[in-house]
């Protein structure tokens, strides 16, 4: 199922910035999703549940995000990607077992001025 | 080696249009490269060699192209991708044997008007 996760629109525009969507299987209950910019961890979101099923979200890098039952979307300013960078979603699955780590969708993002005044978005199949 | 071919910039801007680059191994001497737009064959380029090593190029769909020893680039007008389509490079290798067919790089392309007046390019890792 993880192999199918690249089949979504990874990048889109959102309020003048870029929304990067990292999909994961709906069966996943507890996870860590990291967004890499080149080799640097740009965002790091962990969703876990305690012994009483209480949900805790850790977002140590304070990335604006939106979490659903099958995706984590991170919101970046255009400036964050103006130099051209490779972005990668990396998923760690804690629950259900077994523990898994997977590199999911990835893509190269470049924003630059254009006389055409258009936006070109390409994302993984 | 074929597995490494996605690691290039599939899409780029060129003279007001879009250049879609389909890479292949330098060892390939004779090939057919097809560019799919969704499920439709948009471009079809075949390079073969005759008994005297004479190169023949077939381009039945008359796509503007550029051929090198390791890539075929097709040039599309923006209008060709303005609706948002999935593009896929499909390679058939005739020489050297054995005959092989491979789907190479693919990506989703969407061009639309922007108030930001910028171009956003994302391409496969």
């Amino acid at each position: 199922e993880l192999n199918d996760l690249a089949n979504h629109r990874m990048f889109s525009f959102h309020d003048g910035g870029v929304q990067i969507s990292c999909n994961y299987p709906e069966t996943v209950q507890q996870l860590k999703m990291q967004l890499f910019k080149d080799r640097e961890v740009l965002c790091d979101l962990t969703k876990t549940k305690g012994s009483g099923n209480t949900v805790s979200i850790k977002n140590p890098m304070s990335c604006p995000y939106q979490l659903s039952n099958n995706s984590v979307s991170f919101f970046l300013d255009n400036a964050d990607s103006s130099q051209g960078s490779y972005f990668l979603c990396s998923l760690s699955i804690f629950d259900p077992p077994p523990f898994q780590e997977k590199n999911l969708s990835g893509g190269y993002l470049l924003i630059y001025e254009s006389q055409l005044c258009c936006q070109l978005k390409l994302w993984l199949p | 080696e074929l597995n490494d071919l996605a690691n290039h910039r599939m899409f780029s801007f060129h003279d007001g249009g879009v250049q879609i680059s389909c890479n292949y191994p330098e060892t390939v001497q004779q090939l057919k490269m097809q560019l799919f737009k969704d499920r439709e064959v948009l471009c079809d380029l075949t390079k073969t060699k005759g008994s005297g090593n004479t190169v023949s190029i077939k381009n039945p769909m008359s796509c503007p192209y550029q051929l090198s020893n390791n890539s075929v680039s097709f040039f599309l007008d923006n209008a060709d991708s303005s609706q948002g389509s999935y593009f896929l490079c499909s390679l058939s290798i005739f020489d050297p044997p054995p005959f092989q067919e491979k789907n190479l790089s693919g990506g989703y392309l969407l061009i639309y008007e922007s108030q930001l007046c910028c171009q956003l390019k994302l391409w496969l890792p």
């Epitope: 069966t27 962990t46 305690g50 012994s51 099923n53 209480t54 259900p96 | -």
Partner: antibody, heavy 117, light 111 residues
Framework: EVQLVESGGGLVKPGGSLKLSCAAS????????MDWVRQAPGKGLEWVGN????????NFAPSVKGRFTISRDNAKNTLYLQMNSVKSEDTATYYC??????????WGQGTLVTVSS | DIVMTQSPSSLAVSAGDKVTINCKSS??????????LIWYQQKTGQAPKLLIF???TRHTGVPDRFIGSGSGTDFTLTITSFQTEDLGDYYC?????????FGPGTKLEIK
């Protein structure tokens, strides 16, 4: 190897206070929810409470709510249980346990708390 | 709060016996395809040890003679061939909601 070592147990008078500690090693402490579970002599297991990674979320069993507090120091890899206004029914062996996402997968050896005048 | 009950409260067994311990919850523990039910073993003077989680998944290193089954409100821990080292108390626990609660336990003794 995951290790949890409780300390701080002992004899305490009814109405008194006691602070238990649990030193964790062998894993990234801040990645896990941590819990306290107790067991009265000759009785079954009773969940006391838990705390999330950063100490932002803390839950308690109804029997200890308002009297016990749980905290953690991730820099010291230590979990704490502050027991106030203790009662005789709080007499038990107190275990700290790591919540391994879907079960208590590691337990300490326990520390005995006796509430008696 | 969800109430957990276990039966029997104690059981006298011999080596090689098939042992069945039952656990019942006051409401369904099934959510998103998973039963939020755990089994622990506790030997005298020791801390509990995890045996089974999600009602039927054996924890790492647990012998395959321990089998968890059941769904919803009714669960069973089966020891297909009891060994003397299996002596001790067995507890079920839910983690469906807060507070997580344990069953009262089942004590296995030698016949």
């Amino acid at each position: 190897e995951v290790q949890l070592v409780e300390s701080g147990g002992g004899l305490v008078k009814p109405g008194g206070s006691l602070k238990l500690s649990c030193a964790a090693s062998g894993f990234t402490f801040s990645d896990y929810w941590m819990d306290w579970v107790r067991q009265a002599p000759g009785k079954g297991l009773e969940w006391v409470g838990n705390i999330d990674h950063d100490g932002n979320i803390i839950n308690f069993a109804p029997s200890v709510k308002g009297r016990f507090t749980i905290s953690r120091d991730n820099a010291k890899n230590t979990l704490y249980l502050q027991m106030n206004s203790v009662k005789s029914e709080d007499t038990a062996t107190y275990y700290c346990a790591r919540w391994g996402h879907y079960a208590f997968d590691s337990w300490g050896q326990g520390t005995l708390v006796t509430v008696s005048s | 709060d969800i109430v957990m009950t276990q039966s029997p409260s104690s059981l006298a067994v011999s080596a090689g016996d098939k042992v069945t311990i039952n656990c019942k919850s006051s409401q369904s523990l099934l959510s998103s395809g998973y039963n939020y039910l755990i089994w622990y073993q506790q030997k005298t003077g020791q801390a509990p040890k995890l045996l089974i989680f999600y009602a039927s998944t054996r924890h790492t290193g647990v012998p395959d003679r321990f089998i968890g089954s059941g769904s919803g409100t009714d669960f069973t821990l089966t020891i297909t061939s009891f060994q003397t080292e299996d002596l001790g108390d067995y507890y079920c626990q839910h983690h469906y909601s807060s507070p997580p609660t344990f069953g009262p336990g089942t004590k296995l003794e030698i016949k």
